[in-house]
């Protein structure tokens, strides 16, 4: 298992809610990715292919997400402080293998003008 | 133990049809997608189909040589797979052996003993 | 659909000798290519998958490389127990099985 800080813009802030931007290697096939909260899997992906390159997303833990050839974005609205905590993207690798697990995350700092609906 | 049986090869005559069956155990049948491969007397292995899993909607894929004569199914709730083999010809005369592969998480690969079908 | 050729159709080597089988495939195929044993009278068994990873309880004598459309197959110290039919495989697009191998002692 490889762990690490995001050494990319990992948080993106619109319209009182966040992006969070989970990256993989544009080589990646078949995976899964998990949104973890501290401990906590809040959201996930899965990714497989089948014997005609066709392609199954599966999520057991349901975010809005949004996949593109070398990230998954969740998507979580209505920002309050207690949102603010470290998060984890929990990547499973299955193709190319060997299976191998990486953790990269950080830390979501809410301030007041991230906020969802402030009152002025 | 995972163990893939092979049955109903037999002798059959040129334009007659057979049902071949593989009884899987020691496994989760359900994940894993299902091929057929054959080897004709003395001659190499040739790949003659596959059953992806329900994730992808049992899609089957088969080779130029047996497509529109043979179709393979399944049956997860029995743990089989079937091959439905009509208008025989002399030349599909061979060993045919089921075989379980997957991918995710981890590669495996297991295959039968394999049944003899005659065409004569 | 993708073809795949194997060379040599058959070898002979001494115990102990390095024994190489090289394996082409038709277009690129990546490195979805799996390597097999068959004993006459038995079913394939995996050695090799994704060109260089050994299966489970295979000898680290069996080694593979290779990518794209060349591959190589090594048995580093032949062994009288690897007397066998050797066949590639392609898994890029469903399957397609190389020609065969067969290797014996001199």
């Known amino acids: 298992e490889i762990n690490g800080s995001a050494n990319y813009e990992m948080f993106i802030f619109h319209n009182g809610g966040v992006q969070i931007l989970c990256k993989y290697p544009d080589i990646v096939q078949q995976f899964k990715m998990q949104l973890l909260k501290g401990g906590q899997i809040l959201c996930d992906l899965t990714k497989t292919k089948g014997s005609g390159n066709t392609v199954s997303i599966k999520s057991l833990k349901f975010c809005h997400s949004q996949l593109s050839n070398n990230s998954v974005s969740f998507f979580l609205y209505n920002l309050d402080h207690s949102h603010a905590n470290y998060y984890f993207c929990n990547l499973s690798i299955f193709d190319p293998p060997p299976f191998k697990v990486t953790l990269t995350g950080g830390y979501l700092h809410i301030y007041e003008s991230q906020l969802c609906c402030q009152l002025k | 133990e995972v163990q893939l049986v092979e049955s109903g090869g037999g002798l059959v005559k040129p334009g007659g049809s057979l049902r071949l069956s593989c009884a899987a155990s020691?496994?989760?049948?359900?994940?894993?997608?299902m091929h057929w491969v054959r080897q004709a007397p003395g001659k190499g292995l040739e790949w003659v189909g596959v059953?992806?899993?329900?994730?992808?909607?049992?899609?089957?894929y088969y080779s130029d040589l047996v497509k529109g004569r043979f179709t393979i199914s399944r049956d997860d709730s029995k743990n089989t797979l079937y091959l439905q083999m009509n208008s025989l010809k002399t030349e599909d005369t061979a060993v045919y052996y089921c075989?379980?592969?997957?991918?995710?998480?981890?590669?495996?690969?297991?295959w039968g003993q394999g049944t003899l079908v005659t065409v004569s | 659909d993708i073809q795949m050729t194997q060379s040599p159709s058959s070898l002979s080597a001494s115990v102990g000798d390095r024994v190489t089988i090289t394996c082409q495939a038709s277009q690129d195929i990546s490195n979805y290519l799996s390597w097999y044993q068959q004993k006459p009278g038995k079913a394939p068994k995996l050695l090799i998958y994704?060109?260089?990873l050994l299966a489970e309880g295979v000898p680290s004598r069996f080694s593979g490389s290779g990518s794209g459309t060349d591959f190589t197959f090594t048995i580093s110290s032949l062994q009288p127990e690897d007397i066998a039919t050797y066949y590639c495989?392609?898994?890029?697009?469903?399957?397609?099985f190389g020609p065969g191998t067969k290797v014996d002692i001199k």
């Open positions: 994704y060109t260089n």
């Open positions: 020691g496994f989760t049948f359900s994940d894993y997608f």
């Open positions: 059953i992806d899993t329900k994730s992808f909607n049992y899609a089957t």
């Open positions: 495989q392609q898994y890029y697009n469903y399957r397609t």
């Open positions: 075989t379980a592969t997957i991918a995710v998480p981890y590669y495996f690969d297991y």
